[in-house]
Interface confidence: low
């Protein structure tokens, strides 16, 4: 069921009222402020590292900067999962981890971050500018995905290598609509506050009714409407396509991290230089009830859920082998 922030109907202030800020108009700034504060967009950061000593070995680390509880993490390469990318690992906080070669080890690092080691040798390893994507399904934020790759540079001294301009897809009209309303609201709130700053302090008029303070609530589409959703994502263009992964040669670059997207304050401390593209990962509010874990992304008509996990009663522990078979 879709639930939205319940904002009381606001009538224009009566002419002649000093300050034009009756109790009803006072509600608006607080509602907008609540929306602005609670609508802080979660972010996903992705880091990709190639070991200098082991050029065919990649480490991908992903984290979720949000307050919700993570219900599933999907790591893919060659593009976002559901848009041509191939799944490398799926991590479920309770049912365990399933990974496919060339994933060597997927594991939870913290409650909101994971790491994945990819292994290959020579012609079988992924090429250096392969795109790796991480998608976090969380409640109530929904599904958020970001991608990163090793920038195509082999200069060991480069501390902040240039990253290609990300492509931002925003197919989800609902999210855009809500975002637009929130953005407009925040701007309007600032405008109101600025106007209010230059006016005498208003007198609060006693009201006969004291309506409950509105609560901003996240909305989640029902299962029935999921199929119509599209997951927006931020991704980096790469010249290495999934189809060529089997023959691509590894990039002989240094040991370093490429990060996207993140903020300096939230960056986990990596061992080397950082590259950052401060583009927040976009997401969709996707219901994850009853294992509808696959994103509602662009897919051929014959695709759907079906990400499979290894059920492990012991919880989130990495298991051996591409299918998590001990």
């Amino acid at each position: 069921m879709r639930t939205e922030a319940q904002v009381p109907a606001l009538q224009p202030p009566e002419p002649g009222l000093e300050g034009a800020m009756g109790h009803r108009t006072l509600v608006l700034p607080w509602v907008l402020l609540t929306l602005c504060v609670t609508a802080g967009t979660p972010e996903v950061w992705v880091q990709v590292r190639m070991e200098a000593t082991e050029l065919s070995s990649f480490t991908i680390r992903c984290g979720f900067l949000g307050s919700g509880s993570i219900s599933l993490v999907t790591v893919s390469w060659g593009g976002p999962n559901g848009a041509g990318g191939t799944t490398l690992a799926v991590l479920h906080p309770e049912r365990g981890i399933r990974q496919w070669a060339p994933a060597r080890q997927a594991r939870w690092e913290t409650q909101s971050s994971i790491s994945l080691i990819l292994e290959g040798s020579g012609a079988s390893s992924p090429c250096a500018n392969t795109t790796f994507c991480c998608k976090f399904a969380s409640f109530p934020e929904g599904s958020w995905e970001a991608c990163g790759s090793l920038p195509p540079s082999s200069d060991p001294g480069l501390s902040a290598p240039p990253t290609p301009a990300p492509i931002l897809r925003a197919d989800l009209a609902g999210i855009l609509g809500v975002s637009g309303v929130l953005l407009f609201g925040c701007v309007y709130l600032l405008h109101l506050l600025r106007r209010h700053k230059h006016r005498p302090a208003p007198r609060l008029q006693p009201s006969r009714t004291s309506p409950q303070a509105p609560r901003a609530r996240a909305w989640a589409p029902s299962q029935a409407s999921q199929a119509a959703l599209h997951v927006p994502y931020a991704t980096i263009n790469t010249s290495c396509r999934p189809a060529t992964l089997d023959t691509a040669h590894p990039h002989g670059g240094p040991s370093w991290w490429a990060s996207l997207p993140t903020h300096a304050a939230h960056r986990p401390q990596g061992p080397a230089a950082w590259a950052s593209t401060p583009i927040p990962a976009r997401g969709s509010f996707v219901s994850v009830e009853n294992g509808l874990y696959a994103q509602a992304g662009e897919r051929p008509p014959h695709t759907g859920p079906g990400l499979t996990l290894f059920p492990d009663p012991r919880g989130p522990r990495a298991m051996e082998g591409p299918l998590g078979v001990r």
């Epitope: 999907t74 893919s76 999962n81 559901g82 848009a83 041509g84 990318g85 191939t86 799944t87 049912r95 365990g96 399933r98 496919w100 070669a101 060339p102 292994e119 290959g120 079988s124 189809a243 992964l245 089997d246 009853n290 294992g291 509808l292 874990y293 696959a294 992304g297 897919r299 051929p300 014959h302 695709t303 759907g304 859920p305 079906g306 990400l307 499979t308 996990l309 290894f310 059920p311 492990d312 082998g321 591409p322 299918l323 998590g324 078979v325």
Partner: antibody, heavy 122, light 107 residues
Framework: EVQVQQSGPELVKPGASVKISCKAS????????MHWVKQSHGKSLEWIGY????????GYNQNFKSKATLTVDISSSTAYMELRSLTLEDSAVYLC???????????????WGQGTLVTVSA | DIQMTQSPASLSVSVGETVTITCRAS??????LAWYHQKQGKSPHLLVY???NLADGVPSRFSGSGSGTQYSLKINSLQSEDFGDYYC?????????FGGGTKLEIK
Amino acid sequence: EVQVQQSGPELVKPGASVKISCKASGYTFTKSNMHWVKQSHGKSLEWIGYIYPYNGGTGYNQNFKSKATLTVDISSSTAYMELRSLTLEDSAVYLCAREADYYGNRGQFDYWGQGTLVTVSA
Amino acid sequence: DIQMTQSPASLSVSVGETVTITCRASDNIFSNLAWYHQKQGKSPHLLVYGATNLADGVPSRFSGSGSGTQYSLKINSLQSEDFGDYYCQHFWGTPYTFGGGTKLEIK
């Protein structure tokens, strides 16, 4: 066009071993798991295990761990299953099947070989 | 291991009728389920995956439904080529297991 072609029928003695093959074509062999399934006469299907040609990674049903060994030859895009210490109960049709990867949706078997009949008889 | 219980074991119906085959998993498999059709002497053929998604080339008279532990395959207006054995299979982690099968016979 994706095709999965299996080797012909085998008649073997109890205690012996047999190696059957599954040749794939029409797709990138290294990118999809290849699974093996047993079907005894008039019975249901039993999953034996899989191999990932990319790096030879395998996973087995515990019931077949001591019975089957899965290997691949990437140069010929062929998967193999060796069955050892054969008994009469191992007489069955053995099928190989490619695991699909529909944009991240994996697990289902979308292309199957025609099956290899293994008969164990003294 | 997750066990798959398929019912009925056999079914005798006429062309044009509608049938429903059910599959119950011993644990939640989160829609990680496929349905296959197998004709005598042939290998299985994928019909449905992800519990509800029709595989390429499968006629629309087939439909899959269900979630959690209960799943079903419905065949509307049965055609002569639909007769044979039907199997469900879970792929929620290994070992993958199949249902016992449903034999669909012409009445």
